[in-house]
């Protein structure tokens, strides 16, 4: 399986909400002894391996933000803890999973990573991640709504 990031760059005005998205692609083993663990964390550029550095998102670790279930079941994080920090991660039955960040500030700018761990009990963990950048802007040059740039090209889309 692979993880796709529909958008590689999100440019948002301060105070706006944004939903960062990843998609699980390819055949997914739904066997009894296969589980998928999905989560989000911040990272930084300039590493040998993108997303190898794991930093909290608004003081919440990847463990705090994880989604747990088997196969393509829907799931979401512990609401209380995440929502107190203006965060919510969720997934659907089609392999899409996301993190929503509310009331963005300039401090939210940076590289974000989604991580999928395919747990094959008795064998190993298989990790796949996706990366995307969030730029939060303020002032007259800031867009009125979030603008997203698809991973395949630099054509932008406006989202409200």
């Amino acid at each position: 399986f692979k993880v796709a990031t529909p958008y590689s760059l999100y440019v948002c005005p301060e105070g706006q909400n944004v939903t960062l998205t990843c998609r699980l692609l390819g055949p997914v083993d739904k066997g009894h002894d296969v589980t998928f663990y999905k989560t989000w964390y911040r990272s930084s550029r300039g590493e040998v391996q993108t997303c190898s550095e794991a930093r909290p998102i608004r003081n919440l670790t990847a463990a705090d933000l994880h989604l747990h279930h088997g196969g393509h079941q829907a799931a979401n994080t512990s609401h209380d803890l995440a929502q107190r920090h203006g965060l919510e991660s969720a997934s659907d039955h089609h392999g899409n999973f996301s993190i929503t960040m509310r009331n963005l500030t300039l401090l939210d700018s940076g590289l974000y990573c989604c991580l999928v761990v395919e747990i094959r009990h008795h064998h190993s963990e298989h990790r796949v991640h996706g990366a995307m950048e969030l730029q939060v802007q303020t002032g007259k040059d800031a867009p009125s709504n979030c603008v997203v740039y698809p991973s395949s090209s630099q054509d932008s889309e406006n989202i409200t």
Epitope: S52, A63, H121, S124, E125
Partner: antibody
Framework: QVQLQESGPGLVKPSETLSLTCTVS????????WSWIRQPPGKGLEWIGY???????NYNPSLKSRVTISVDTSKSQFSLKLSSVTAADTAVYYC???????????WGQGTMVIVSS | EIVLTQSPATLSLSPGERATLSCRAS??????LAWYQQKPGQAPRLLIY???NRATGIPARFSGSGSGTDFTLTISSLEPEDFAVYYC?????????FGGGTKVEIK
């Protein structure tokens, strides 16, 4: 804040079954791996096995024939059973939370189990 | 199973000195390696995961590096509370295994 607490008899006779329980408080047991690790006196750490919240288990091959780990989500507890014990099984037994693709981030304080007649 | 060999077995240093601990794997573990600290009578405490990511609440004087088969835990300036036994642990596959430990003692 998640906390783990081991409980069970501190003395087990040779050939009998060692039984320990770990109680998870301050958080949900319905996620992560829940592991048992042991440490013989003056020695290093040995991973015994885990139970995933879904019920899937995975054991160290060196102990697999003697180990059973189970979970009771309604009580927020998981348990270890180690059969046919010998003096070599004397150790401090720890329960721990293991985060997928991460590490053992929360440990119980450990409980000493002595195998002796 | 993957064997982790830690060296030295004992490291005798003074407070304020730099400690460099080594962990070598019998085969590549990528960067899937953790470090723990254990003090007498206590459970191990997670310091570093994925070779260099500091766990929550761990002071910046602890840092990890390496990938493949060779890893290093560095304590930049030893504090009195840092004298303990340190273990490495791999998680690239099961069974999860630990190194034999390095004891950092006061010189």
């Amino acid at each position: 804040q998640v906390q783990l607490q081991e409980s069970g008899p501190g003395l087990v006779k040779p050939s009998e079954t060692l039984s320990l329980t770990c109680t998870v408080s301050g958080g949900s047991i319905s996620s992560y791996y829940w592991s048992w690790i042991r440490q013989p006196p003056g020695k290093g750490l040995e991973w015994i096995g885990y139970i995933y919240y879904s019920g899937s288990t995975n054991y160290n091959p060196s102990l697999k024939s003697r180990v059973t780990i189970s979970v009771d989500t309604s009580k927020s507890q998981f348990s270890l059973k180690l059969s046919s014990v010998t003096a070599a099984d004397t150790a401090v037994y720890y329960c721990a939370r293991d985060i997928p693709a991460s590490a053992f981030d929360i440990w119980g304080q450990g409980t000493m189990v002595i195998v002796s007649s | 199973e993957i064997v982790l060999t830690q060296s030295p077995a004992t490291l005798s240093l003074s407070p304020g000195e730099r400690a460099t601990l080594s962990c070598r794997a019998s085969q590549s573990v990528s960067y899937y390696l953790a470090w723990y600290q254990q003090k007498p009578g206590q459970a191990p405490r997670l310091l570093i995961y994925d070779a260099f990511n500091r766990a929550t609440g761990i002071p910046a004087r602890f840092s990890g590096s390496g990938s493949g088969t060779d890893f290093t835990l560095t304590i930049s300036s030893l504090e009195p509370e840092d004298f303990a036994v340190y273990y490495c642990q791999q998680r690239i596959n099961w069974p999860l295994t630990f190194g034999g430990g390095t004891k950092v003692e006061i010189k």
